[in-house]
C-alpha cells in the first residue's frame, strides 16, 4: 500500500513539475526590466527564451520573436536545449510511469517489469529536473553577469552614434517557476526510484520442505514469516545515474546587454 502511494505521489509530483517546466519554457518573463533605482519609464521590457516583449503604459504589448538562430548567444541556445531535453525526458518518463503504476493492470505484466519501468521513469524525471534546474540557473547566471556590466551602451541611430541608458534586466517569474518545477520533477523522480525498491518481487533462498515423521503425518513448513534481509535472489544493482549532465564553466563573451532581438 505504501509502495503504491509513493509511486502514485511520485507520478503526480513529477506531472506537476513537468507541466511547470513546459510553462516556464513557454513564458516570456525570463528576464524583466529592473525598476529599482531607475527612472520610472512608461515602457516596460521583458524577455523570454523565444521572444522579447515591450509593454507600454497605453496597455499595448508588442512581442518580437528571435527569428535568427545563429545570431543568438550560445548561452541562450544552451538554456533552450536544456529546457527542451528536460521536457522530452519528462514526457517520456510520464509515458513510461503510466504503464508502471501499480494501480493500472496491463495484460499479464510482471511486477519485475513494473519495477524496472518505475526505475526508468524515476531516472528520467531526475535527469529532467536537473536539466530544468541547470537551464534556469545558467540563464540566471547570465542575467547577473549582464546586470553588473556597464550601464551605458552605444547604438547606431539615424543620426549616428547615440548614447542611451542601457536597460538592465533582473530575474523574471519564469525563473522561479522553472526552479520550483525542476525541483518537483526531481523529487518525483526520487519517489519513483524509492517506490521501485518496494515493487521488486523478493524471492526466498529456501523452499518449503515436508518432513514426514514416522508415526505422524505433520508437515513442518519453515519460513512462516518473511524477513526482508536483502540477501535473496533480488540482488539487482539499482544505481541511479545522473545522465551525465555537466555544466561547463567556460569563459563566455557575454553580450553587453541581455537583448537578443
Amino acid at each position: 500500500m505504501a509502495v503504491t502511494a509513493c509511486q502514485g505521489l511520485g507520478f503526480v509530483v513529477s506531472l506537476i513539475g513537468i507541466a511547470g517546466i513546459i510553462a516556464a519554457t513557454c513564458m516570456d518573463q525570463w528576464s524583466t526590466q529592473d525598476l529599482y533605482n531607475n527612472p520610472v519609464t512608461a515602457v516596460f521590457n521583458y524577455q523570454g527564451l523565444w521572444r522579447s516583449c515591450v509593454r507600454e503604459s497605453s496597455g499595448f504589448t508588442e512581442c518580437r520573436g528571435y527569428f535568427t538562430l545563429l545570431g543568438l548567444p550560445a548561452m541562450l541556445q544552451a538554456v533552450r536545449a536544456l529546457m527542451i531535453v528536460g521536457i522530452v525526458l519528462g514526457a517520456i518518463g510520464l509515458l513510461v510511469s503510466i504503464f508502471a503504476l501499480k494501480c493500472i493492470r496491463i495484460g499479464s505484466m510482471e511486477d519485475s517489469a513494473k519495477a524496472n519501468m518505475t526505475l526508468t521513469s524515476g531516472i528520467m524525471f531526475i535527469v529532467s529536473g536537473l536539466c530544468a534546474i541547470a537551464g534556469v540557473s545558467v540563464f540566471a547566471n547570465m542575467l547577473v553577469t549582464n546586470f553588473w556590466m556597464s550601464t551605458a551602451n552605444m547604438y547606431t541611430g539615424m543620426g549616428g552614434m547615440v548614447q542611451t541608458v542601457q536597460t538592465r534586466y533582473t530575474f523574471g517569474a519564469a525563473l522561479f517557476v522553472g526552479w520550483v518545477a525542476g525541483g518537483l520533477t526531481l523529487i518525483g523522480g526520487v519517489m519513483m526510484c524509492i517506490a521501485c525498491r518496494g515493487l521488486a518481487p523478493e524471492e526466498t533462498n529456501y523452499k518449503a520442505v515436508s518432513y514426514h515423521a514416522s508415526g505422524h503425518s505433520v508437515a513442518y513448513k519453515p519460513g512462516g514469516f518473511k524477513a526482508s534481509t536483502g540477501f535473496g535472489s533480488n540482488t539487482k544493482n539499482k544505481k541511479i545515474y545522473d545522465g551525465g549532465a555537466r555544466t561547463e564553466d567556460e569563459v563566455q563573451s557575454y553580450p553587453s546587454k541581455h537583448d537578443y532581438v
Epitope: G59, T164, V165
Partner: antibody
Framework: QIQLVQSGSELKKPGASVKVSCKAS????????INWVRQAPGQGLEWMGW????????TYAEGFTGRFVLSWDTSVSTAYLQISSLKAEDTAVYFC???????????WGQGTLVTVSS | DIVMTQSPDSLAVSLGERATINCKSS????????????LAWYQQKPGQPPKLLIY???TRESGVPDRFSGSGSGTDFTLTISSLQAEDVAVYYC?????????FGGGTKVEIK
C-alpha cells in the same frame, strides 16, 4: 468615431474648488488611459498626470500632487479632474487626452478654460 | 525630469519652402526592447487642442499629410515640413513618452514669411 467631450468654462474665486469632466465615446473607456494636460495663457503644454481606468492606477506629475485629484466613473465613461484650493496661477486651459498605442495622445478633448479670479 | 529643448522658438518660412524644427532630449528616448524612440510631435492652432502628427519619432499618424516627416534617434529629433502650406501655421510641440513625468518641449511657432 472617437470623441472626448469636456465640460464648459469655469470662473472661480481663489480657494474654491472645480471639477472638470471628460466624457469619452466611440471606444471602450476602460481600455485606454486618460491623460490631463494644462496650458496656461500664452504658455506651452504641461503634463499633469493620468488615470488607467482598467487597473485603477493614477500617476501625477511632481507639481500636481495634493490639490489635484484624478478620478473616473466607468458607468458613464467619464474622467474627472478636481482642483481644490484654487489659486490665480491655476488659470489655464485643461485638456484631457487618450493614451494610445505608442504612448501617444491620439485624441484630445476640446479643452476647458478655468479662470481663477477674485 | 526629462528636459525637452526645442529650437528655434519661432520660424518664418515662405510658402512652399521647407521648415525644420529641432528637439533635443536630456536623456535617450530609445527603448532597447523594441528599438523605438518614444517621441511624438503635435501641432496646435490657436483656440484648438493639440493634434498628433508623428509618434515613435518617425511614424506618421493616419490622416496627416505626407509633407510632415519626423526623424532622429536617441536624444536628437527633427520635424520637417517639406513644403509649407498656409494651414500649417501653428505652434509645434515635441513630447517624450518614455519617462515619467511625460514632458513637452517649449514649442516652436511657425509663421509664413
Amino acid at each position: 468615431q472617437i470623441q472626448l467631450v469636456q465640460s464648459g468654462s469655469e470662473l472661480k474665486k481663489p480657494g474654491a474648488s472645480v471639477k472638470v469632466s471628460c466624457k469619452a465615446s466611440g471606444y471602450t473607456f476602460t481600455n485606454y488611459g486618460i491623460n490631463w494636460v494644462r496650458q496656461a495663457p500664452g504658455q506651452g503644454l504641461e503634463w499633469m498626470g493620468w488615470i488607467n481606468p482598467n487597473t485603477g492606477e493614477t500617476t501625477y506629475a511632481e507639481g500636481f500632487t495634493g490639490r489635484f485629484v484624478l478620478s473616473w466613473d466607468t458607468s458613464v465613461s467619464t474622467a474627472y479632474l478636481q482642483i481644490s484650493s484654487l489659486k490665480a496661477e491655476d488659470t489655464a486651459v485643461y485638456f484631457c487626452a487618450r493614451l494610445y498605442y505608442g504612448n501617444r495622445f491620439d485624441s484630445w478633448g476640446q479643452g476647458t478654460l478655468v479662470t481663477v479670479s477674485s | 525630469d526629462i528636459v525637452m529643448t526645442q529650437s528655434p522658438d519661432s520660424l518664418a518660412v515662405s510658402l512652399g519652402e521647407r521648415a525644420t524644427i529641432n528637439c533635443k532630449s536630456s536623456q535617450s528616448l530609445l527603448n532597447s526592447g523594441n528599438q523605438r524612440n518614444y517621441l511624438a510631435w503635435y501641432q496646435q492652432k490657436p483656440g484648438q487642442p493639440p493634434k498628433l502628427l508623428i509618434y515613435w519619432a518617425s511614424t506618421r499618424e493616419s490622416g496627416v499629410p505626407d509633407r510632415f516627416s519626423g526623424s532622429g534617434s536617441g536624444t536628437d529629433f527633427t520635424l520637417t515640413i517639406s513644403s509649407l502650406q498656409a494651414e500649417d501655421v501653428a505652434v509645434y510641440y515635441c513630447q517624450q513618452a518614455y519617462y515619467y513625468p511625460l514632458t513637452f518641449g517649449g514649442g516652436t511657432k511657425v509663421e509664413i514669411k
